[in-house]
Each structure stands twice: as structure tokens, then as C-alpha cells.
Interface confidence: low
């Protein structure tokens, strides 16, 4: 499987809410011993591999934000910490993943990745991850709403084996 | 059968530090949460933190933030715990546990504990 | 922290008995919460998973209920086997925090 980044660059004004998305693609295992592992985390661009370096969302580890599931199961960050912090991690039966941000500040500017694990239990794993940056912004410059850019063909596929 | 060992028991002296080896077998070791839990004698259980080896970053109880330090080496499928400027109430049996489901906080398997005896 | 409070601290029970446990959490925890059996000398052994789910191997006679901040530990028939310390534990958000435990203790 793949994932997909549909937008690689998120250009949204102060205060703002944002919904970063992600696309798992290709034949996904439904089986019992099958779960994907889904969560969001800032990184910085490294000279050898986007997404290398795992931060935290608003001091919330990947480990808060994750989500579990078999197969295309729907699923969705419920925790109270996450929503204190005005993040919501959410997942369809589509294979679409996605985070919300509340109330953008310029803080929120960075590089954001998205992270899914395949694991065959006992077995194996797989992982997959894609990127992309969110810019924040104020004054007369900043757009009344946020404005997405498509990803080119060649980013909008991010694949990472383990 | 996955199986969790740790190493043996330690007999340290207050101010001092320990370090803890918990060697998995059996299954895929680095996309499932291992944390450690420690229990003093006669008391309940504590969690200290835990790490899921393939971010390599662990995430700590405030308690202990500062002190412990948890890494895991996936070449060799290990996880350690080190807690530095040891007490008397550090005294306890510490455990290692993964996570039954990658990064849920069930714990599944359990090593058979390492008693660390803080004394002068 | 999410703190868990078990109760009773302790039981006298005699074989054959129902034994009811119960734990409540400072904050909804929705179903995330696991009970785990400490004999001792032994590592603790997970029971039941996220509220109500046996865990492989577990006889039928454990069962769980609950959700949001009020759960149950449930053994229908208490076997000789079963005497031991009973922990929950939340798994909703990390601090991940026990109960103070139950000791289950032959009458």
C-alpha cells in the first residue's frame, strides 16, 4: 500500500481551522491479524529523509494523536487532551486520514506528516508516510481562507518501507 | 510465543543509577509499545514510561521525567529503562510489558521483573 | 493524571462465590480500561482489555463491563486458582494509571 498526500501545501490565515489529510492506497489487508497503526507529527525537511525527525503537535506526541484499527475501520481521536489542544485525528472507510487544527496561530507554521504502520501480527510490519507544510499566516497578505496546492504526481505518493 | 527477559537483580547505593535490559523473542519487537512498571514491596503498580522502538522517542510520567531514560535497540530487540539518582523509595521490582496492539496501552506480555534494591 | 480508584482494598471470598470488583475512573476513559491478575512473586497477567474483552487463554468465568468511568470485574465462580490481587488499569491517555488493587482472600 501506498500514501497519498492530496494537497502538499497548506496556505491558511491566524485563527483559522485546518484539516490536513492523508490517502492510504492499494490493496489493504483486511484480515484478523492485520492492524494499521495511523498518527500525525511535525518534522522538519532533512537532508535525507523528510519525516525522519518525529515532534510533537502542539506539545501532543504521535503517541497521543494515534489511531488503531483493522483494515478501512473508521476511526477518531476522542481524547479530551487532543481536543483541549484543538486537534482531532480521524480516519474514514475510504482509506482518508486526516487532523484538524483549531484557531491557527503562526506557531502552527511547519512540516506535517502523516504516519501509518501495517502490522501482521508477529510477523511484520510496514510503514508509510507522507508530508506536507502548512504555512500560517496574518495580516493583509494572509488569504480570507485557507488555500490548498495539489501535490504533483511524484510527492503525492510518499512510500517508506520498514 | 513472544517472551520478555530481563536481566537481574541489582543492589545500588543511593545516588547512584541503574539500567535495566528487557530482551524480546517471538514476535515483531519494534512497532509495540514496551513500558516499564514498577511495583515497591507490598504496593500497587506504576507506570514509568514507555517507547514504541521504531520512533525510538519514549514518553514518561511527569514523576519521573527527568530521571528515567528508556531506549530500545531493534537490532537486538531490547528495551532498557535507566533511572539515575536513586533513593530508598526506588526499592522495587521493575517490569517491562508490550503492548498487546502496537500502540495501545494493554500489556499483553509481561517480563518476570528485576528487583532493584536502593541501599547504603 | 486520570486516577483510578478500586474498591473494596480487600475481600474474603469463598470458592464457588461470585465476586463483583469495581473501579471508577476521575474522567471518562470510554472503554479503555484492561484488569490484570497479580499472583505473588509474578508478573501481573492481563484478564480483560478494553472493558469487556477476555483476553486469549482466560477462562469464561472473568468478565467485564463498564464504560466511561464506572467498570466492573466480574469472576462468576471463584475457583482456588483465583486468589490473588485484581488491578485496573486505563489505557485512555498516557500517564497510564492502576488502580490500588483488590485482594481477593480465601474466607
Known amino acids: 500500500f501506498k500514501v497519498a498526500t492530496p494537497y502538499s501545501l497548506y496556505v491558511c490565515p491566524e485563527g483559522q481551522n485546518v484539516t490536513l489529510t492523508c490517502r492510504l492506497l492499494g490493496p489493504v489487508d483486511k484480515g484478523h491479524d492485520v492492524t494499521f497503526y495511523k498518527t500525525w507529527y511535525r518534522s522538519s525537511r532533512g537532508e535525507v529523509q523528510t519525516c525522519s525527525e518525529r515532534r510533537p503537535i502542539r506539545n501532543l506526541t504521535f503517541q497521543d494523536l494515534h489511531l488503531h484499527h483493522g483494515g478501512h475501520q473508521a476511526a477518531n481521536t476522542s481524547h479530551d487532551l487532543a481536543q483541549r489542544h484543538g486537534l482531532e485525528s480521524a480516519s474514514d472507510h475510504h482509506g482518508n486520514f486526516s487532523i484538524t487544527m483549531r484557531n491557527l496561530t503562526l506557531l502552527d507554521s511547519g512540516l506535517y506528516c502523516c504516519l501509518v504502520v501495517e502490522i501482521r501480527h508477529h510477523h511484520s510490519e510496514h510503514r508509510v508516510h507522507g508530508a506536507m507544510e502548512l504555512q500560517v499566516q496574518t495580516g493583509k497578505d494572509a488569504p480570507s481562507n485557507c488555500v490548498v496546492y495539489p501535490s504533483s504526481s511524484q510527492d503525492s505518493e510518499n512510500i517508506t518501507a520498514a | 510465543q513472544v517472551q520478555l527477559v530481563q536481566s537481574g537483580a541489582e543492589v545500588k547505593k543511593p545516588g547512584s543509577s541503574v539500567k535495566v535490559s528487557c530482551k524480546a523473542s517471538g514476535g515483531t519487537f519494534s512497532s509495540y509499545a514496551i513500558s516499564w512498571v514498577r511495583q515497591a514491596p507490598g504496593q500497587g503498580l506504576e507506570w514509568m514510561g514507555g517507547i514504541i522502538p521504531i520512533f525510538g522517542t519514549a514518553n514518561y510520567a511527569q514523576k519521573f521525567q527527568g530521571r528515567v531514560t528508556i531506549t530500545a535497540d531493534e537490532s537486538t530487540s531490547t528495551a532498557y529503562m535507566e533511572l539515575s539518582s536513586l533513593r530508598s523509595e526506588d526499592t522495587a521490582v521493575y517490569y517491562c510489558?508490550?503492548?498487546?496492539?502496537?500502540?495501545?496501552?494493554?500489556?499483553?506480555?509481561w517480563g518476570q521483573g528485576t528487583l532493584v534494591t536502593v541501599s547504603s | 493524571d486520570i486516577q483510578m480508584t478500586q474498591s473494596p482494598s480487600s475481600l474474603s471470598a469463598s470458592v464457588g462465590d461470585r465476586v463483583t470488583i469495581t473501579c471508577r475512573a476521575s474522567?471518562?476513559?470510554?472503554?479503555?480500561l484492561n484488569w490484570y491478575q497479580q499472583k505473588p512473586g509474578k508478573a501481573p497477567k492481563l484478564l480483560i482489555y478494553?472493558?469487556?474483552s477476555l483476553q486469549s487463554g482466560v477462562p469464561s468465568r472473568f468478565s467485564g463491563s463498564g464504560s466511561g468511568t464506572d467498570f466492573t470485574l466480574t469472576i462468576s465462580s471463584l475457583q482456588p486458582e483465583d486468589f490473588a490481587t485484581y488491578y485496573c488499569?486505563?489505557?485512555?491517555?498516557?500517564?497510564?494509571?492502576f488502580g490500588q488493587g483488590t485482594k481477593v482472600e480465601i474466607k
Open positions: 488499569q486505563q489505557s485512555y491517555s498516557t500517564p497510564l494509571t
Open positions: 474522567q471518562s476513559i470510554s472503554s479503555y
Open positions: 510489558a508490550r503492548s498487546s496492539y502496537g500502540w495501545s496501552y494493554e500489556f499483553d506480555y
Open positions: 478494553a472493558a469487556s
